[in-house]
């Protein structure tokens, strides 16, 4: 298994990737195999109103850059422990045997893992796009004994920014083939999303692929600068009752989802009110209603609010309500 | 493309329960509300009631309030309207939608017939 | 009995206009958008106008939509064979918290 997977992001749309090479290889290193799949957004953030008193946005960092070559760790392999900021304390006697014990039982069940569970891959030409894998096919356990063996999960890759589809094993997933080094920058990512990484080491080229089992880590690519941002005009129709019915686009592709929006308004003379209006309201109204406004001159400012963070507001737009009573209308029927 | 989808057509016999479904594909299921909405043979449309998917927020029509039940699960992307108890009365096509402009069904589920007779 | 009133039936001969009233209360059309759907015969409906008078993208632009105080219409011009349905309005009402429906409109050409 590859050792000490560092993933970071020094981009919107790259993750970098650095790791060790296998501490007992089965023979020569080869090449390393690269996968990486999109994460969906934790459920929960759809669920939750974050307009609500007392509800803290929630804290979605990208990976960032490395400090320096071997600093600390900022996304752990899913098989290390954060040893936070502290330094390790010198390796007792017993210690350094039970590596010993627990590097030879790695090598032994890698040589399981080849040999009994999977039936070597024919290699596959090219980088990229196509994942060679579905053509290593599983052996039945069966016929193995009572042996319990975990095979690694997929995640969801939605297509959409909501409901999550899981893909099947059998599914293509983007992957790179890294031959005579320890890293990897893997470009055309979406922007601050999270992707779940996946790392092997093989012994063989050809004719015949040997690959290690996976080792995982997670990351999530930086920000798009002015992804938050409302784009277009906001419009508004003023109904006879004073009720001004404010609409606008939500941003195509934001940093995320958003999580809110921020209504900024203010009559002419007076101070600025703001009105928060969760995903849920602005599912129903594509907008928002401001209700019993007294005449006069209004402005009005949006912003909305993503994973991560706030985008711009948008230039003011101006509306005049009149005096409803003074106004002819037909509501009597 | 965006669509819903809803179960077949049901036949029942009155005080029989029946849960009828409306699927949704193409598009971010838990980020718009759907409603339900009545048409009985010959009819108009009578609104239901709507659910929010993200969170399960339900509001009903005070007409069915108590006589239907709408739930919804994310995780398959449906959205359910059921019954507990079936009148001879509730015989009408039954319609799901996407609320997407401002308070207005946009894409519409293609109907379930519910047939409740003795 | 449907909150918003419509004509039960309309109709018009090919090429001619035709407009179908809606109208309301203070608390549905008054203060809310109105939407229009056309329904054919034994089909779902469809969206054809929304917030008063947009047309979603593949609706002919011979459907017009416009809202005033408490009523609304939809105007139909160049009638054509397949305008042939039934066509319902609706708005929001912000007592019932809840869109309402107009009892429909049955639109011949003759």
């Known amino acids: 298994v590859p050792l000490d997977p560092i993933s970071v992001s020094n981009s919107s749309s790259q993750i970098i990737l650095k790791w060790k090479p296998p501490s007992d290889p089965n023979g020569n290193i080869t090449h390393y195999l690269v996968f990486w799949e999109r994460q969906a957004e934790d459920s929960e953030l759809f669920e939750l109103d974050y307009c609500l008193k007392g509800l803290k946005l929630p804290s979605r960092t990208w990976s960032p850059p490395f400090e320096s070559e071997d600093s600390q760790k900022h996304n752990q392999s899913e098989y290390e422990d954060s040893a936070g900021e502290c330094c390790s304390c010198p390796k007792t006697d017993s210690q350094i045997l039970k590596e010993l014990e627990e590097s030879s039982f790695r090598k032994t069940f890698e040589d399981y893992l080849h040999n009994v569970v999977f039936v070597p891959r024919k290699t596959s030409s090219g980088t990229g796009a196509e994942d060679p894998r579905p053509s290593r096919k599983r052996r039945s356990l069966g016929d193995v004994g009572n042996v319990t063996v975990a095979v690694p999960t997929v995640a969801a890759f939605p297509n959409t920014s909501s409901t999550s589809v899981p893909t099947s094993p059998e599914e293509h997933r983007p992957f790179e083939k890294v031959v005579n080094k320890e890293s990897l920058v893997i470009s055309g990512l979406r922007h601050f999303t999270g992707y779940r990484i996946e790392l092997q080491a093989c012994n063989q080229d050809t004719p015949e692929e040997r690959c290690s089992v996976a080792a995982y880590v997670s990351a999530r690519t930086m920000p798009e600068a002015k992804a938050d941002d409302i784009v277009g005009p906001v419009t508004h129709e003023i109904f006879e009752n004073n009720v001004v019915h404010l609409m606008w686009q939500e941003p195509k592709e934001p940093n995320g989802l958003i999580v809110l929006y921020e209504v900024s308004y203010r009559r002419y003379g007076d101070e600025e009110l703001h009105l928060c209006v969760s995903r849920k309201h602005f599912a129903l109204e594509r907008g928002c209603r401001l209700r019993g406004l007294s005449p006069g001159n209004y402005s009005v400012r949006i912003r909305a609010t993503s994973l991560a963070g706030n985008g711009s507001w948008t230039e003011p737009t101006y509306f005049y309500v009149t005096d409803y009573l003074d106004v002819p209308s037909n509501i009597a029927k | 493309q965006m669509q819903l989808v809803q179960s077949g057509a049901e036949v029942k016999k009155p005080g029989e329960s029946l849960k009828i479904s409306c699927k949704g594909s193409?598009?971010?299921?838990?980020?718009?509300?759907i409603g339900w909405v009545r048409q009985m043979p010959g009819k108009g449309l009578e609104w239901m009631g709507i659910?929010?998917?993200?969170?399960?927020?339900?509001r009903y029509s005070p007409s069915f309030q108590g006589q239907v039940t709408i739930s919804a699960d994310k995780s398959i992307s449906t959205a359910y309207l059921q019954w507990s108890s079936l009148k001879v009365s509730d015989t009408a096509m039954y319609y799901c939608?996407?609320?997407?402009?401002?308070?207005?069904?946009?894409?519409w589920g293609q109907g379930t017939m519910v047939t409740v007779s003795s | 009995s449907y909150v918003l009133t419509q004509p039960p039936s309309a109709s018009g001969t090919p090429g001619q206009r035709v407009t179908i009233s809606c109208s309301g209360s203070?608390?549905?059309?008054?203060?809310?958008?109105v939407t229009w759907y056309q329904q054919l015969p034994g089909a779902a409906p469809k969206l054809l106008i929304y917030?008063?008078?947009q047309r979603p993208s593949g609706v002919p632009d011979r459907f017009s939509g416009s809202r005033s105080g408490t009523s609304a219409s939809l105007a139909i011009s160049g009638l054509q064979s397949e305008d042939e349905a039934d066509y319902f309005c609706?708005?929001?009402?912000?007592?019932?918290?809840?869109?309402?429906f107009g009892g429909g409109t049955q639109l011949t050409v003759l």
């Open positions: 939608g996407r609320i997407s402009t401002p308070y207005a069904f946009d894409i």
């Open positions: 193409g598009y971010s299921f838990t980020g718009y509300w």
């Open positions: 659910i929010y998917p993200g969170d399960s927020d339900t």
């Open positions: 203070n608390s549905n059309i008054g203060s809310n958008f």
């Open positions: 917030t008063n008078s």
């Open positions: 609706a708005a929001w009402d912000d007592s019932l918290n809840g869109p309402v």
